[in-house]
Amino acid sequence: LIQERRSHEVNPAAHLTGANSSLTGSGGPLLWETQLGLAFLRGLSYHDGALVVTKAGYYYIYSKVQLGGVGCPLGLASTITHGLYKRTPRYPEELELLVSQQSPCGRATSSSRVWWDSSFLGGVVHLEAGEEVVVRVLDERLVRLRDGTRSYFGAFMV
Amino acid sequence: LIQERRSHEVNPAAHLTGANSSLTGSGGPLLWETQLGLAFLRGLSYHDGALVVTKAGYYYIYSKVQLGGVGCPLGLASTITHGLYKRTPRYPEELELLVSQQSPCGRATSSSRVWWDSSFLGGVVHLEAGEEVVVRVLDERLVRLRDGTRSYFGAFMV
Amino acid sequence: LIQERRSHEVNPAAHLTGANSSLTGSGGPLLWETQLGLAFLRGLSYHDGALVVTKAGYYYIYSKVQLGGVGCPLGLASTITHGLYKRTPRYPEELELLVSQQSPCGRATSSSRVWWDSSFLGGVVHLEAGEEVVVRVLDERLVRLRDGTRSYFGAFMV
């Protein structure tokens, strides 16, 4: 797994931003803006919510999601799970990479209280060419999108 | 915007730390220590709270602020906003880069309860030479400084 | 302190993951998995909970811990402290590098309520060869381990 940063190569990096279309409600991963505003791809590609690796190596991957609500939606579990997951041809199921669990609704002491919370994840993982990384949030009903600055997803080779 | 990391060049990086003078109360961005203790600048400069880019490229920028209080200050909005913002001559207004909203006071179930919370932001953005990045916290009355380890601001080229 | 990233060298990086043995209850730092699953060491070494630097330079160091509980353990202080600390032969005591304080129990409005919270730290520090970085959590009784994805510790040279 030895991997070097060669001086003549552009270092892979990406930053994808939240958009109106990010929340599908289908149970799939979050979708992301890849070109407009602050979003970019450099030496990585994108497919249906996934950052796709084109060059094997160690990557610092990160995601932030902005959560918010008024009280807690009926039937919402007390736990929100925000995670980064890997898809690889080597294995049939998604693999958890970095995960956080939070109980943000618990901050609201009354059912009509507005609350906000944020979840940040970041860490170094090894990724092979062709492997994909996606972001999932359960329950995504509490993700608050606005302008791409509050919920995002990115990576760079280290 | 293609940018390479050349082997003979020092990679720009900085870590600035919170100090007693960080909170101005003037409505401006937070100010930072640049030399003492853990703080340093390498290939980036500093001016009035801003990290100033000297070499164009993609940078991972980050900030953490330590929040705390006893109950909630009278008249304090239920939302605390912590953000990283860009200033560029290309546009007349500051541009939001990475932002978090939190409702930390909501954790305190009584008005006399001590509470602590922390907000972390990090992400990759493209910055041109001469552009500035600043940190803002609204309401900064809840930022708790101590020794430079709890609130900080940094960047490095990726 | 000028340090360059040379193209023919492997860039030091590591990601260590939480394991059943991470929480010692002895008051020492958290211990980590270094080889299995997502964990790896590349150009850094490990000793009794510490990442040990073999090559001097600036490193982005990070840690996340997953916190959780049912109400608040009797006698638990209202503050949880999660920090990254440096050990150096130059100084007899550990030095705080990056620290967060949180009051996660305050989210639970009743003593029987389940709550979850997460604390993330990351920042750039200068480390000399032979220096060590450890993670501490006070009170570690609230750290929730599972599979290495929720609590972790890592670093890479920038």
Partner: antibody
């Protein structure tokens, strides 16, 4: 599109006063750092003063030759910047430009308005 | 007070040639806060370069800036007829807060 349009210039006697206006469009003036820059006939550019954005406190700074005589202000409701010039001197004769002043450079300029101080 | 001195005062060149304009500071200035402007007769100045080397929006890539410390350069790689104008350098950060050079006139030979 960002646009700045100055007005209010004209002929004034030494010791007199004049108020210049700069109407901004395409952005919110209160969110911007703004400056006035002047240029005497056939001469180079000279910075006059600046006002910071509202979020940065809206504080003002002035060049030494005009300090105490000139005042920069803003009317946020009209998205307009002002330069109040008192105790005018013949050496204040110039074209006055309204400019944005983010990150140490003047990114956007108005077309300028001529102020002539003469008896 | 930092003084910016531009040279030459006048530069006579033909279209297609390369122009090199110099700006020297009386003491070291931050390269992050060194800008260049172009001004044509009867018009307002236009920002060309900021941060010593970053091109402003819409500026053709034949314009480039370089330098650090006390010596800065604006280069126009291949002169077009519309490039003949007066060029000013400007610094920010030292008292007075913003300072301009006296200008270099680029004229057609």
């Amino acid at each position: 599109e960002v646009q700045l349009v100055e007005s209010g210039g004209g002929l004034v006697k030494p010791g007199g006063s004049l108020r210049l206006s700069c109407a901004a469009s395409g952005f919110t003036l209160s969110n911007a750092w703004m400056s006035w820059v002047r240029q005497a006939p056939g001469k180079g550019l000279e910075w006059v003063g600046r006002i910071k954005s509202k979020i940065d406190g809206g504080t003002t700074d002035y060049a030494a030759p005009v300090k105490g005589r000139f005042t920069i202000s803003r009317d946020d409701s009209k998205n307009t910047l002002f330069l109040q010039m008192n105790s005018l001197k013949t050496e204040d004769t110039a074209v006055y430009y309204c400019t944005t002043a983010m990150a140490g450079a003047f990114g956007f300029w108005g077309q300028g308005t001529l102020v002539t101080v003469s008896s | 007070e930092i003084v910016l001195t531009q040279s030459p005062g006048t530069l006579s060149l033909s279209p297609g040639e390369r122009a090199t304009l110099s700006c020297r500071a009386s003491q070291s200035v931050s390269s992050s806060y060194l800008a260049w402007y172009q001004q044509k007769p009867g018009q307002a100045p236009r920002l060309l370069i900021y941060g010593a080397s970053s091109r402003a929006t819409g500026i053709p890539d034949r314009f480039s800036g370089s330098g650090s410390g006390t010596d800065f350069t604006l280069t126009i790689s291949r002169l077009e007829p519309e490039d003949f104008a007066v060029y000013y350098c400007q610094q920010y950060g030292s008292s007075p807060m913003y300072t301009f050079g006296q200008g270099t006139k680029l004229e057609i030979k």
